[in-house]
């Protein structure tokens, strides 16, 4: 018989989690003994099992361990792991700290969506990233010409939405544009949103006649000539 | 005509509840996150909270997080307040303001429209 | 938090002259989109803040074109080529890019 004893002290020493809320956490604390010991957990000094939080946890017996997602301020608080068997009992303290973030308008991630060059009847995708605390929103939208005008009596241009999206933080959203006409030629917007406000970056899609054969293959030649 | 209509201001005591209203017309109010912006007496403004259009993502200054609580009800175009703990420092004219739509908006992205805001009083 | 810092506290303003008012953010509103995220409100007495200036230079409609906001990331300006009786009141500058959002400490202009 043994009392428990942790299998990866080296796994533990880092004591103090300071985390931007929203994040996920994890606190491990991977034993052993004989016999096989159990593990509980406690929230400043309380036994702890997650039921007055939102979310939830998880707790993974086999990992020695316990999970608490989108963190919150008041999910601050000394969190132990507390080991034992008949033989004897381990504990260990974790600090939390969940770091308050100021809300701020999507950020979108710079050169995306980027200005595309296709061929008639081929497919584009165009990326936009976006970086935002509160849960984001999209949309794609397509600058149209209205009367051989881009925009109205007020300024403002003419656009067709051609999605809107709900995504989870730091998701890449993709425009599929399936087999391109010269008609999809335009500029692009990815619009995003929040609680806070709207951001918006544009790209420009260039739509080429369809290729022709006698001319890609007389192309090369063409290059060493004066 | 979008309007924002406040209600629900009064005089109560430092320590009581106070629950304010604010009633949206003249456009899609399920599309705009709302916010709160108050104003004491003789002094500048103050933003107190914001609610995403669906009330998922709700966001409160330092001075009221823990004791106001923004929510809002689409189904009746209203947004609200509630107050507790109130302290005579919260004495101000409270404003209900259209925040930032779900899509594409021509002009500015929110904090064109303001109520003619309700007044709360916290005095013993 | 983002501090905005007015100047000056008070302006008064022969009509017909032009009036002009600072406010510093005490950290860049220039976002990623390449937008300028600074608004000027002009509250009258008894009235809520109306919108004047969006996005640090473009009118709200119906502003009248005396008004104009110009600056950069952190130093903002708000211009009024022609006072008129009708603009007296308090002008504040917004930052519109994070909460909490926050307003400078107001500008009242008065007529001479």
């Known amino acids: 018989q043994q009392a428990p004893y942790w299998t990866h002290p080296q796994r533990m020493e880092k004591k103090l989690h300071a985390v931007p809320a929203g994040n996920t956490v994890k606190f491990r604390c991977p034993a052993a003994g004989n016999p096989t010991p159990t593990i509980r957990w406690l929230k400043d000094g309380q036994a702890f099992h997650g039921e007055n939080r939102i979310g939830g946890i998880r707790l993974r017996h086999q990992h020695w361990s316990l999970v608490m997602e989108s963190v919150v301020p008041s999910d601050r608080g000394t969190y132990t792991c507390l080991v034992e068997n008949a033989v004897g009992s381990i504990r260990y303290n974790y600090l939390l700290d969940v770091l308050e973030r100021s809300p701020h308008r999507p950020i979108l991630q710079a050169g995306l969506p980027a200005n595309t060059t296709a061929v008639v009847g081929s497919d584009v995708e165009l990326l936009c990233k976006v970086y935002s605390d509160a849960q984001p929103h999209i949309q794609w939208l397509k600058h149209i010409v209205i009367n051989g005008s881009s925009f109205g009596a007020d300024g403002f241009p003419y656009v067709q939405v051609l999605k809107t999206a709900d995504i989870n933080s730091s998701e890449v959203e993709v425009l599929y544009l399936r087999n391109v006409s010269a008609e999809d030629a335009g500029e692009y917007t990815c619009l995003a949103g929040n609680s806070i406000g709207l951001s918006y970056q544009s790209a420009w899609l260039t739509v080429l006649p369809e290729e022709d054969p006698t001319w890609t293959a007389a192309a090369p030649e063409a290059r060493y000539t004066d | 005509e979008v309007q924002l209509l406040e209600s629900g201001g009064g005089v109560v005591q430092p320590g009581r509840s106070l629950r304010l209203s604010c009633a949206a017309s003249g456009f899609t109010f399920s599309s705009y996150a709302m916010h709160w912006v108050r104003q004491a007496p003789g002094k500048g403004l103050e933003w107190v909270a914001v609610i995403s259009y669906d009330g998922s993502n709700k966001y409160y200054a330092d001075s009221v997080k823990g004791r106001f609580t923004i929510s809002r009800d689409n189904s009746k175009n209203t947004l609200s307040l509630q107050m507790n703990s109130l302290r005579v420092e919260d004495t101000a004219i409270y404003y209900c303001?259209?925040?930032?739509?779900?899509?594409?908006?021509?002009?500015?992205?929110?904090?064109?429209?303001w109520g003619q805001g309700t007044m709360v009083t916290v005095s013993s | 938090d983002i501090v905005m810092t007015q100047t000056p506290l008070s302006l008064s303003v022969t009509p017909g002259q032009p009036a002009s008012i600072s406010c510093r953010s005490s950290?860049?509103?220039?976002?990623?989109?390449?937008?300028?995220?600074v608004y000027w409100y002009l509250q009258k007495p008894g009235q809520p803040p109306q919108l004047l200036i969006y996005?640090?230079?473009n009118r709200f409609s119906g502003v009248p074109d005396r008004f104009s906001g110009s600056g950069s990331g952190t130093d903002f300006t708000l211009k009024i080529s022609r006072v008129e009786a009708e603009d007296v009141g308090v002008y504040y500058c917004m930052q519109y890019i994070e909460a909490p959002l926050t307003f400078g400490g107001g500008t009242k202009v008065e007529i001479k």
């Open positions: 996005e640090l230079s």
């Open positions: 950290r860049s509103l220039l976002h990623s989109d390449g937008k300028t995220y």
């Open positions: 303001v259209r925040g930032a739509g779900r899509g594409y908006t021509y002009g500015p992205d929110g904090f064109d429209i």
